[in-house]
Structures are given as C-alpha cells and as structure tokens.
C-alpha cells in the first residue's frame, strides 16, 4: 500500500493584516483512519491551531466540509489576521488510537503578515536654537511587516543626508519599528520651513506616509536693535525710537531706562508678520530735556523669548545748545553703545 502523503502546496503565504489567510492541506489517502490537526511551529512547544473534533477555534474555519465522506481536503481559513499570527503552520495526520498517534506532518506553510506602518511621528528639540546651530529631529513609526522599509527626510524639498536610521528588532519578529534621527542646520529664514519624514512600505502601495514638524517650533531668531533720536521739538521734548527687527518668536519685552531707572515696560503682542515669518516692533520714548539738569542716559533693553537682555544705550546732552540738535541719529548696532546727542 502506498505511503500516506500530507501535502501543503505553498511554502509561504503572505497576507495583509485584517484579511483572511487560507492554508492548504490535502492528504493522498483516506487510510489509516485518524484525525488531522493544525499546529503553529514544530516540536514540543508547538501551538494547536485547529482540531475538528474538540476545542473552540472561533477564527479558524475549514475550507471544505470535513465531515463529508471521503474528504481529503483539510485546508483551513484563519480570519482577521494580525501580525501575531505570523509563523509556520503544519498540517499533521494522526492515527486513531488511545491516544491518537502522530503519523505524518506536512512540510509547513510559512504565514507572513503584511502590516502597515503607523503614521510617522516627528519630534523636535525640547528647547529652541538659533540660526547656524544644528538641531536633531526624530521620526518613529511602528507595527509594520515585513521588515523592509524606506525612510527619507526632507527640509522643505531638499532631501537630508545627515541621517541615522534603525529598524528594530534586528532578528525575526511579527512586526517592526523604525526610528530615525536627522540633524538639521537652522537658518534665519527657517520660521516657515518644515522638516518632513517620509516612510515607504510595501503595504502602502506607493503612497508614502508623512510626518512633519515645523521649524517655527525649534528656532529662535534674535532681534536686531537700533535706537534713533528725532530732532528736538520746540517744547524741549526729544523723541527717541527703539526699532526691534527680524525676531521670532513674538515673545518679547522691551524696557526703557532713564539713567538706569525703569521708565516704561512693554510687551509685544498682535504684531504683523514679516514675509519670512519674523516680527518687527518699534517703541517710542518722549524725553523732556528741560526736566533734566544733567545728561540723560537712555537705554532700550530687550528681553526676547526668555534670553538674557540685550541693551542699546546713548546719552542725550542737555547742557548743549538745543538749536544745534541733530536729526535721526542712530546708536550703533552691536553691543551696548553710548552716543552723545548734541
């Protein structure tokens, strides 16, 4: 009599998560009498997947009616596949007895589960950095299978190359995760820039998933300060202007000091945005020269986004002749400057 064969025609089957998987198995003979059982894995630790006679297997159904006379098809369908179902499935013939004795196993069918990666999540630095500094962004995506995946970084439409990417775990697993870090050099123009992490995987059918981070969350553009003084008015009042330009974010406090004493403090709010996303702000101070005997040292002090204050100072000479008053005289643009206004 010819030896019984247990035939599993497919060496491997690949199924998308959520779909059903069909695992085929036929036998070459009806004898000897005895049941067929399905297992995942081999050896003593194998897991029973389906046994027609007993047990409750809600996700597993036979493809053909196993109670039908002369049935030789013992294929099964597993519904609602998840990555945890991945593994090698064996169709095993037993000889009827007390207990039943394992007679022959099929060659096994490896079930791999195609699972989509989660939407990439991009996180940036915890604290803001200024232009010319390098900041790191991290992109993470999880739960995908198979392991092969492509991740690209862009700053706007320029692909980034200073990138380090890891897929875990290194060995075989039911699903995988990817973590990538990109180093980005900031420029003063980056308030409106975006960093984009793009993940491409076989399950996405060509439509990559994207995660983005706005560089406006990562950048600080410190202000330029310029102090100018208009012509002396007839009523002996001097109008002094402090122009604060090209800063981001908007969080800014400006304090006027007269001879070291606080004259006025203002907070920037609801400023119009420049084309590049930065802000400008102008503050005026009227100084009554006739109320002062000595020269007046004026300081415009700006505290931007919690950073140490930046000062611009100059002196108004009250002892000089008012008629010779200069017009539109500017304090220099770097450091703490004093300028005598005549």
């Amino acid at each position: 009599e010819e030896e019984l064969q247990v035939i599993q025609p497919e060496k491997s089957v690949s199924v998308a998560a959520g779909d059903s998987a069909t695992l085929n198995c036929t036998v070459s003979s009806l004898i000897p009498v005895g049941p067929i059982q399905w297992f995942r894995g081999a050896g003593p630790g194998r897991e029973l997947i389906y046994n027609l006679k007993e047990g409750h297997f809600p996700r597993v159904t036979p493809v053909s009616d196993p109670t039908k006379r002369n049935n030789m098809d013992f294929s099964i369908r597993i519904s609602n596949i998840t990555p945890a179902d991945a593994g090698t499935y064996y169709c095993v013939k037993f000889r009827k007895g007390s207990p039943d004795v394992e007679l022959k196993s099929g060659a096994g069918t490896e079930l791999s589960v195609r699972a989509k990666p989660s939407a990439p999540v991009v996180s940036g630095p915890a604290v803001r950095a200024t232009a010319e500094h390098t900041v790191s962004f991290t992109c993470e995506s999880h739960g995908f299978s198979p392991r092969d995946i492509t991740l690209k970084w862009f700053k706007n439409g320029n692909e980034l190359s200073d990138v380090q990417t890891n897929v875990d775990p290194a060995g075989k697993s039911v699903s995988y995760s990817i973590r990538s870090t990109a180093r980005v050099v900031l420029t003063r123009r980056d308030v409106h820039s975006q960093v984009i992490c793009e993940v491409a995987h076989v399950t996405l059918q060509g439509d990559p998933l994207r995660g983005t981070a706005n560089l406006s969350e990562a950048i600080r553009v410190p202000p330029f300060l310029e102090v100018t003084q208009q012509s002396m008015r007839a009523d002996n009042q001097v109008n002094v202007t402090c122009q604060v330009t090209k800063f981001y974010p908007q969080r800014l406090q400006l304090t006027w000091l007269e001879n070291g004493n606080v004259s006025r403090t203002e907070m920037a709010s609801a400023l119009p945005e420049n084309k590049d996303g930065t802000y400008n702000w102008t503050s005026w101070l009227l100084v009554n020269v006739s109320a002062h005997r000595d020269d007046v040292k004026l300081t415009c002090q700006v505290e931007h986004d919690g950073q140490p204050a930046v000062n611009k100072s100059f002196s108004v000479k009250v002892s000089a002749h008012p008629k010779e008053q200069g017009s539109n005289t500017a304090a220099e643009n770097t450091g703490t400057n004093e300028r005598n206004i005549y």
């Epitope: 092969d148 492509t150 862009f154 706007n156 320029n158 190359s161 984009i196 491409a200």
Partner: antibody
Framework: QIQLVQSGPELKKPGETVKISCKAS????????MHWVKQAPGKGLKWMGW????????TYVDDFKGRFAFSLEASASTAFFQINNLKNEDTATYFC??????????WGQGTTLTVSS | QIVLTQSPPIMSASPGEKVTLTCSAT???????LYWFQQKPGSSPKLWIY???NLASGVPARFSGSGSGTSYSLTISNMEPADAASYFC?????????FGGGTKLEIK
C-alpha cells in the same frame, strides 16, 4: 507659474570649460533641490546628481566626479553646472530638474552641448 | 546601484490597442519612489506617473501604473497617436538614483 529656464546651446573644443545655467521662477528656490540629467544623442536619460539649494552641498554619481561641478547663486534663483577639460563624449543635452517630495515635477528645456575639434 | 531594464526597447501599437511597458529592477525598489517620464523628440521629459500608480497632472486616464519590488509596468488601455513617445522609468529609492534605458513607443 513654475519655470526652469536653461542657458542656450554651446559649441566647445576638447579641453575647454563650459558652464550651463538653470534659472528657476515661480517658487522658493531654496526649498527644492536641483537635479541634473544627461542625455547623449539618441540615448536615454542619465542621472548625474543633485545640489541642496539651501546648503549648496552637491552630490555626484560616480561617473560624474572630478571634472563636473554643481553650484548655485541662490540670490538669483539660479543653479549652475560646469564641466572642465571637455571631452567628445560630453556631447549631450543637459537638463536641470526640480527635486523635492515629487522628484522631477518640473524640467528645464535642456541645453545642448557639442564638443568638437 | 539599482539597474532598471525596460522592455521592449522599441515597440509599435495601433490606435485603440492595449499597450504594456515593463521596468525590471536588479534589486527591490520602494513603490513610492518608482516614477515614469514621457519624452517626445526635441522636448524635455515630463513627469507622467509618480509613486508607481499616481497619474501626474494632465495625464489622460487611459494611462495606469502598477508593480512592486523589482517589477513595474505602465499600461495604456487604448493607444492614441498622442501617446507615441519615449517612456523612462526612474527610481529614487536608493542612491545613486537611476533611469531605465527607455521604451520608444511608435504608432502603427
């Protein structure tokens, strides 16, 4: 609308240098990489490399390392491609193409270079 | 580097005929980064299909793209005279980016 306009045809002798320009308009130049593609007469397309328009960092394919140079004048929204020590086999049409998240969505009209003694 | 081989190199089709152009890669290419370009004589290439199956702006619906891994194709459901051109596949999945040798499609 978005346009890439390349400089006109060039006729050069072997050993000379050529510099081809590609002027971009209709978008923020520094937000999209610029790629260069060679097409020899009657042949297919060959990707030569690209330049990061923000950092000006070039990337060259191995076949185009040495005599070839990508450069920028970002203030003029213009990318350049230079070949030194020209050889007969450099005879081709050279295209600039915008990169980004949808590679090659806009191309220049091409610059024909003829190298002949 | 990934070499893209297009077949056939030259083919002709009659108006109304279904046409399939293939692009075979020496190693796996992410479908997101497999593009097709159309080029007519004396003109620059035009982006035709991006990310394997998405038609670029203005491309007629009779065009379609499919594939994964190392095998990709561009199909024209019913050939029209305007479709006579050269078609190039392009991968930018991994460096160096490469083009296929092209298929020249002629009208009968």
């Amino acid at each position: 609308q978005i346009q890439l306009v390349q400089s006109g045809p060039e006729l050069k002798k072997p050993g000379e240098t050529v510099k081809i320009s590609c002027k971009a308009s209709g978008y923020t130049f520094t937000h999209y990489s610029m790629h260069w593609v060679k097409q020899a007469p009657g042949k297919g397309l060959k990707w030569m490399g690209w330049i990061n328009t923000e950092t000006a960092e070039p990337t060259y394919v191995d076949d185009f390392k040495g005599r070839f140079a990508f450069s920028l004048e970002a203030s003029a929204s213009t990318a350049f491609f230079q070949i030194n020590n020209l050889k007969n086999e450099d005879t081709a049409t050279y295209f600039c193409a915008r990169g980004g998240l949808r590679q090659g969505d806009y191309w220049g009209q091409g610059t024909t270079l003829t190298v002949s003694s | 580097q990934i070499v893209l081989t297009q077949s056939p190199p030259i083919m002709s089709a009659s108006p109304g005929e279904k046409v399939t152009l293939t692009c075979s890669a020496t190693s796996s290419v992410s479908a997101s980064y497999l593009y097709w370009f159309q080029q007519k004589p004396g003109s620059s290439p035009k982006l035709w299909i991006y990310s394997t199956s998405n038609l670029a702006s203005g491309v007629p619906a009779r065009f379609s793209g499919s594939g994964s891994g190392t095998s990709y194709s561009l199909t024209i459901s019913n050939m029209e005279p305007a479709d006579a051109a050269s078609y190039f596949c392009h991968q930018w999945s991994s460096y160096p980016y490469t083009f296929g040798g092209g298929t020249k499609l002629e009208i009968k």
